[in-house]
């Protein structure tokens, strides 16, 4: 059962796992949610009746029954983890805490103009978990405007004390705001020889990499595969760090793989969601329950529905035994990973999908692409919306993309002559325009946010956000697309598609069925040669065939240029402008979304 509200002056008795320090009860709840075992917590607020050494303590708790006895205690605030809830969860914490000093290892001290600058510095520093900034009113002259970057083993402060005229806050890496490079490369036959901060068991290098990504201290990892010569180290995932933030060296070792934390692009990759099944593999751990199940998929469902289950092993039924049902072993451990992994025993293992909601919805796998043809099928582009105007009569105006449960990203030029958001309607989950009738449900638009530097499509900044009046419930036919990561600027997208209901040639009409076309990206240099009379800036991206023939056209504006990378779809471009449609040596020009990620996040995450 999902309980979101906090219980004031209430303490949960017993069940303690560990104690951390957090600046608020709200953040204590987030820490509990991300902890592999925590189901409940008790936070102690500052209070004259409470010993100051206990202020800001956040006690993480577990219980077999999923609840604990409640005791009245002044200044105690208790609650439940969001593990029990189905809604999207984020570790992003933009709050600034006034007059609080969050203690940790102060590894960097520098002058900053403001707390915001200090927070940005922390976000763009590979080691930084949180910071404390001494304001210009700070009593000690030599400490004024000093920005202290801090880290700890857990990513949370080792203590929090009251201190006048300072402010503290957390790194915004988990808000997708870091400019740090995202090193997605996995290095086969490679060991990184740096200090291990932790080790866990993992079934493959990808799970090892995801564990590294959400571990607060892990910057890179080495994984020993099941063929590793030393039996005791098989399936071992070593989580590593170094002072420089990069491995000091690489050593060649057969059957080992190494890679990096993807912390700075974790919003556009699955990190908590280990959805694969591992055949002929047994996961060992503390047994929670043994249940009969028809298949390994059914076993995974059982694990996902049991809040304390972290992973499972399914043993298929022996012929005609137990009505064809196998045994489903639901398991857990202190860190969420198996304590040992065994091969060759016939089991099928996997992880709970309960934690998938801690990943961005946009990373969810969608239906496989339909190859060939130009007409899309239902659910193929679930982020694509059709934006209608009702004035003077109702018609399709532009395309757009769902990027959040209340947000559509589109082109600014779509709103030329649109006086009010009241005349706009957003239809999602639509394949054919003919589906849209009087009674078809739509989302009203609360606000149109046009980039304040926009003048005309050809000069750039052709980007706009629509804030919807109500939230979108994600389904297979309507769900968000990931924004590209700032740390991924060097990625080459090779699987890009433009979609829309626009014209199929210059003089045409709006199409009934959503059209799709696979289009290669073109370098900005090449694009500039094709548009000598225009300035193709780095905030634009071009796509098209040299010979023409496939392109976006009138009516596709504002729609997505969607590119698949590492099994995840990214909104790389917004259909903006071009010379004619599908003309030879005239690529389409799109708004380069990665260059506007800060702007998008600033507008959509504004409190």
């Amino acid at each position: 059962e999902c309980v979101t509200q906090l219980l004031k002056d209430t303490c949960f008795e017993g069940g303690d796992i560990t104690t951390v320090f957090t600046p608020s009860a709200k953040y204590c709840q987030v820490v509990c949610t991300y902890h592999p075992r925590c189901l409940l917590f008790t936070f102690t607020a500052e209070s004259p009746s409470e010993d100051p050494t206990r202020w800001f303590t956040c006690v993480l708790k577990d219980s077999v029954t999923e609840t604990l006895p409640r005791v009245n205690r002044t200044a105690a605030i208790s609650g439940y983890s969001f593990k029990q809830c189905s809604h999207q969860i984020s570790a992003c914490n933009k709050d600034i805490y006034v007059d609080l000093d969050m203690k940790g290892i102060n590894y960097n001290s520098s002058v900053a103009k403001s707390a915001q600058e200090c927070q940005e510095r922390c976000t763009d520093d590979v080691h930084c978990h949180f910071f404390t900034y001494a304001t210009r009113q700070f009593p000690s002259l030599e400490h004024r405007n000093i920005c202290l970057l801090k880290h700890t083993q857990t990513g949370t402060p080792t203590r929090i004390t009251k201190l006048d005229k300072v402010v503290s806050g957390f790194s915004l890496k988990s808000c997708a705001l870091s400019n740090l490079a995202c090193i997605r490369d996995i290095f086969p036959n490679t060991v990184f020889a740096d200090s291990n901060i932790d080790s866990v068991m993992a079934p493959d290098a990808f799970v090892c990499g995801r564990i590294c990504t959400h571990h607060p201290g892990c910057l890179f990892f080495t994984f020993f595969s099941q063929e590793w010569p030393k039996e005791s180290q098989r399936n071992l995932c070593l989580l590593k760090t170094s002072e420089s933030g990069l491995p000091s060296t690489r050593i060649k070792k057969s059957k080992a793989l190494s890679g990096f934390s993807l912390q700075s692009c974790r919003h556009s990759i699955p990190v908590f969601c280990h959805s694969s099944f591992y055949h002929d593999t047994d996961f060992l751990g503390e047994e929670l329950d043994i249940v009969a199940a028809k298949s390994h998929e059914a076993c995974q469902k059982l694990c996902t529905n049991a809040v304390r289950c972290q992973f499972f092993t399914y043993t298929p039924a022996q012929a005609s035994c137990n009505e064809g049902k196998g045994k489903c072993y639901l398991k857990l451990s202190s860190n969420g990973s198996p304590t040992k992994i065994l091969h060759g025993r016939g089991g099928i293992s996997g992880y709970t999908l309960r934690l998938c909601k801690m990943d961005n919805e946009c990373t969810t796998k969608i239906k496989p692409r339909i190859v060939g043809g130009t007409a899309s099928v239902r659910g193929e582009w679930p982020w694509q919306v059709t934006l209608h105007t009702t004035s003077p009569t109702q018609r399709h105006l532009c395309g757009g993309s769902i990027i959040g449960n209340q947000w559509i990203l589109t082109a600014a030029h779509c709103f030329y002559g649109v006086e009010s958001p009241k005349i706009l309607r957003v239809y999602s989950g639509i394949l054919n325009q003919s589906e849209i009738k009087e009674d078809t449900s739509f989302f009203g638009v609360q606000e149109i946010i046009i980039h304040d530097q926009y003048k005309m499509a050809e000069s750039g900044y052709d980007i706009a956000l629509l804030k919807l009046e109500t939230t979108v419930n994600y389904t297979d036919s309507q769900r968000p697309i990931c924004l590209p990561s700032k740390g991924d600027r060097n990625v080459i997208y090779t699987d890009c598609w433009v979609t829309g209901w626009g014209y199929r040639k210059l003089r045409d009409k709006i199409q009934n069925t959503l059209q799709k076309a696979k289009i290669p990206l073109v370098t900005n240099e090449e694009c500039q040669k094709r548009y000598r009379g225009h300035k193709i800036t780095h905030k634009m991206i071009c796509a098209g065939y040299r010979e023409g023939g496939k392109d976006a056209c009138k009516g596709d504006s504002g729609g997505p240029l969607s590119c698949k990378h590492n099994e995840v779809w990214h909104l790389v471009g917004i259909t903006s402008w071009g010379e004619g449609c599908a003309q030879r040596e005239r690529p389409g020009v799109y708004t380069n979304v990665v260059e506007y990620v800060d702007w998008i996040l600033e507008k959509t995450q504004a409190v």
């Epitope: 490079a181 090193i183 490369d185 036959n189 690489r250 050593i251 060649k252 060097n490 080459i492």
Partner: antibody, heavy 118, light 107 residues
Amino acid sequence: EVQLLESGGGLVQPGGSLRLSCAASGFTFSDYEMAWVRQAPGKGLEWVSSIVPSGGWTLYADSVKGRFTISRDNSKNTLYLQMNSLRAEDTAVYYCATWGDSWGFDFWGQGTLVTVSS
Amino acid sequence: DIQMTQSPSSVSASVGDRVTITCRASQGISSWLAWYQQKPGKAPKLLIYDASTLQSGVPSRFSGSGSGTDFTLTINSLQPEDFATYYCQQADSFPIAFGQGTRLEIK
């Protein structure tokens, strides 16, 4: 067919700078780790620097650390070596090469000569 | 850092001869060693990696052996096109290091 074509070499004074480029074709450049290897006149081979496919991690020989910067532009299939504070001992033919899973330099360019002299 | 030492620094042989070049690492490098051939005015060419695995397209008269610190490159039945300089390279860890080279010349 894999092709690597270096350019940008020439004569430069000690303390000066030079930027080498290596244009790649015939393979998926963005999938490969790349490197620069140099050879002083009449001498052996010396590894200079490497860069991973994403460009996010670079490694350098101690002899060039802090003076040389390796980079790549995957959209242009091009590898670069920015050389600053050049010394006489940096005089060499500079080769660009692909670095394979075998931990060997699989393919090499024809090289570009850098001469540092006053 | 690992240092590589090749011997001899030069060797004279005739077409049809069998030639052996050795390479020693300053510390154990398992079998992580590569061999290259370089002709005057040309770029080096990878011959062998992992001490004994022939790179595709390399004639079978070339072979490599060894592990730990001592390695050899053997050329059976020398052909005219084999006269060149040969380099070994440790592929155990960064920084990558080459041997100083062995010049194979016609007797």
